[in-house]
């Protein structure tokens, strides 16, 4: 692995337990939880750091859908069965033999159900809403600073090549990223941008995953920019299917 | 080099609780993981679960959650299972091994009997 | 839990016989960041502990002799014995620690006729 071998630790996630147990005595490092050896130079998938992450409140609330079949992740924290891959397993299930079908980024798709549930296949979140409200500064931050600056955190810290990086919206103080990637346009290396809103949602709150670098120091031409608020949307290749009730809720 | 001891065999009443050592020398016992398997008389290999001694991560194999509690001493390298409500069907040789891909190093083994 | 399944559960073959085994995960074992297969055999004979003989499907364990070597990917693997000697009589595992819990096959036992 490509962990640091002085002192054998993953600068992409600090879930993790590094040994220089790999082959040759190389440094090897295990996602807590789930014991899958991962890529320390690149993100790891979100599946395995939910899985890492015990519990810790999450809340996530919807103010305004951007469209009809647009999802938030409003159950929060859970402990998830991941593939042999890293992704999420189509069929997630409680200890109480509750289940329920996910999208590709773990966020429930469907009404739950029992043992029973089927969940044919892991649907793809193909665009991704990041919604974020900046706190009062003296005046607004020029559009295409934000941009920029925006653009060139997903493409430096978090690895997603730029052109998923769709669009960034600004209307002060909303700022919306937008982030596109089909599965034939993804290929094999490139970061999910599923993993990348997820390890950005982290360093937004504080809570980053890199290991041993400070936590996030977004600014905008040296004025720093503080998010107060964040939503995140996700639509998937094929709409979610959940009953009459929960829609007209 | 590398070697893992383990404590001698035990002889105990079902209900009973049992406590095996295996106390590693050679390596630096903190950066390794180390597991222990269950052997029962006649049959396969069962993992039980592993702890790294240096933060103290432990897994347990969800069979044995409650059966067994894994725990280590760095100042003296030893990791320790501890066995409890001991029933005939955990009869069986219980051994350490240090983990990962180049780690070829196994305890000789503790038996354990459970017996009235 | 990832289930393993070996064949044959056991065979008798005559010294010098070229022998093979295999094991069969109900997921795969190949790791997509580094395609490193874990998958390990070992060797146990009557009253000691498991030795390590493949690690990484494929690498042999340093001591190991040469007769031994193991192949496969995903989810099938073999583990050969070119040349079968009378001290390889034993019971052999396939072990995979891709993910927690790690789980043994149910052993091949390997005899001389």
């Known amino acids: 692995h490509t962990a640091a071998q002085d002192n054998c630790t993953c600068p992409t996630n600090k879930m993790t337990v590094c040994s220089p147990d790999g082959p040759g005595g190389r440094c090897q490092c295990r996602a807590l939880g789930s014991g899958m050896a991962v890529d320390c130079s690149t993100l790891t998938s979100k599946c395995l750091l939910l899985k890492a992450r015990m519990s810790a409140p999450k809340n996530a609330r919807t103010l305004v859908r951007p469209s009809e079949h647009a999802l938030v992740d409003n159950d929060g924290l859970y402990d998830p069965d991941c593939d042999p891959e890293g992704r999420f397993k189509a069929r997630q299930c409680n200890q109480t033999s509750v289940c329920w079908c996910v999208n590709s980024v773990g966020v429930r798709r469907t009404d739950k159900g029992d043992l029973s549930l089927r969940c044919d296949e892991l649907v793809r979140t193909h665009h991704i809403l990041i919604d974020l409200r900046h706190r009062p500064t003296a005046g607004a931050f020029n559009h295409s600073d934000l941009d920029a600056e925006l653009r060139r955190l997903f493409r430096e810290r978090y690895r997603l090549h730029p052109k998923f990086v769709a669009a960034v919206h600004y209307e002060q103080p909303t700022i919306q990223i937008e982030l596109r990637q089909n599965t034939s346009q993804k290929a094999a290396g490139d970061v999910d941008i599923g993993d990348a809103a997820y390890y950005f949602e982290r360093d937004i709150k504080g809570e980053s995953l890199f290991q041993g670098r400070g936590g996030l120091d977004l600014r905008v031409r040296g004025e720093p920019l503080q998010v107060e608020r964040t939503l995140i949307y996700y639509l998937d290749e094929i709409p979610p299917k959940f009953s009459m009730k929960r829609l007209t809720a | 080099q590398v070697q893992l001891v383990q404590s001698g065999p035990e002889v105990v009443k079902p209900g009973a609780s049992v406590k095996i050592s295996c106390k590693a020398s050679?390596?630096?016992?903190?950066?390794?993981?180390l597991g222990w398997v269950k052997q029962a008389p006649g049959q396969g290999l069962e993992w039980i679960g592993n702890?790294?001694?240096?933060?103290?991560?432990?897994n347990y194999n969800e069979k044995f959650k409650g059966k067994a509690t894994l725990t280590a001493d760095t100042s003296t390298s030893t990791a320790y299972m501890e066995l409890s409500s001991l029933r005939s069907e955990d009869t069986a040789v219980y051994f350490c091994?240090?983990?990962?891909?180049?780690?070829?190093?196994w305890g000789q083994g503790t038996l354990l009997t459970v017996s009235s | 839990d990832i289930v393993m399944t070996q064949s044959p559960d056991s065979l008798a073959v005559s010294a010098g016989e070229r022998v093979t085994m295999n094991c069969k995960s109900s997921?795969?074992?190949?790791?997509?960041?580094?395609?490193?297969?874990?998958l390990a055999w070992y060797q146990q004979k009557p009253g000691q502990p498991p030795k390590l003989l493949i690690y990484?499907?494929?690498t042999r364990e340093s001591g190991v002799p040469d007769r031994f070597s193991g192949s496969g990917s995903g989810t099938d693997f073999t583990l050969t014995i070119s040349s079968v000697q009378a001290e390889d009589v034993a019971v052999y595992y396939c072990?995979?620690?891709?993910?927690?819990?790690?789980?043994f096959g149910q052993g091949t036992k390997l005899e001389i006729k």
């Open positions: 050679g390596y630096t016992f903190t950066i390794y993981w």
């Open positions: 990484g499907a494929s």
């Open positions: 072990q995979s620690d891709h993910i927690y819990p790690y789980t």
């Open positions: 091994a240090r983990e990962g891909s180049n780690s070829g190093y």
């Open positions: 702890i790294f001694p240096g933060s103290a991560y432990i």
């Open positions: 997921q795969s074992l190949l790791n997509s960041g580094n395609q490193q297969n874990y």
